[in-house]
Amino acid sequence: AQEVQQSPHCTTVPVGASVNITCSTSGGLRGIYLRQLGPQPQDIIYYEDGVVPTTDRRFRGRIDFSGSQDNLTITMHRLQLSDTGTYTCQAITEVNVYGSGTLVLVTEEQSQGWHRCSDAPPRASALPAPPTGSALPDPQTASALPDPPAASALP
């Protein structure tokens, strides 16, 4: 099964710093989303070769891209405490394929020592992340495609 390789699995950074998240696939990709998981998941970016990338307004002006959709590095700048969370790559192939996620811990500089990432990375998977509530449609019901997680489309 096709996988999305995502790195790092966890990173701790001080407020105002930057973080790189890399999403790599083995081809057959049509586009890729970076989604922030949580009670109200949301798309952070949508990237497709040859198309102007779309960025959520909360991150506008704070995101850079390098590489191509098959091997994409997303750089988030000027991180804020509220940016703490798990970010997952979602590849659009013939089905939906998910990366293992990157836990980004944004800390006050003086408290960095109290927040550390564990060493065990989560496994990448072609299975969907656990579904969560959302206001948008679920076309996978009674279909041959896997049930994807819920979240909002980019504004």
């Epitope: 586009g31 989303y33 798309d43 040859g50 948008l136 679920d138 489309a153």
Partner: nanobody, 115 residues
């Protein structure tokens, strides 16, 4: 609220053509990967075409070369051009977000291929 309104279905003879439309609202259509699905009586719903925001498309072998999906982001509308229709294309056709964001389906549009 999310709304998906499919139209353009009807009765057509084998070998004929139809053009389906789907008007979407209530979510950011221009950034969504959109799929057309169909469900025949007693069968599972199946994906028949999908299109990315940048226009990349995919089709199953059963419709490849006969169906063409397209989109107009300015009108929040996705289309499905169906040519060389076969008896087995008879179904209710729906459009929706390919990623499955939520739980809403439109009413669909009935396509009947019959001689």
């Amino acid at each position: 609220a999310v709304q998906l309104v499919e139209s353009g279905g009807g009765l057509v003879q084998p070998g004929g053509s139809l053009r389906l439309s789907c008007a979407a609202s209530g979510f950011t259509f221009s950034n969504a990967v959109i799929g057309w699905y169909r469900q025949a009586p007693g069968k599972q719903r199946e994906l028949v075409a999908s299109i990315t925001p940048g226009g990349r498309t995919t089709y199953p072998d059963s419709v490849k070369g006969r169906f063409i999906i397209s989109r107009d982001n300015a009108k929040n509308t996705v289309y499905l051009e169906m040519n060389s229709l076969k008896l087995e294309d008879t179904a209710v056709y729906y459009c929706n977000d390919f990623r499955g964001l939520g739980g809403y389906w439109g009413q669909g549009t009935q396509v009947t291929v019959s001689s």
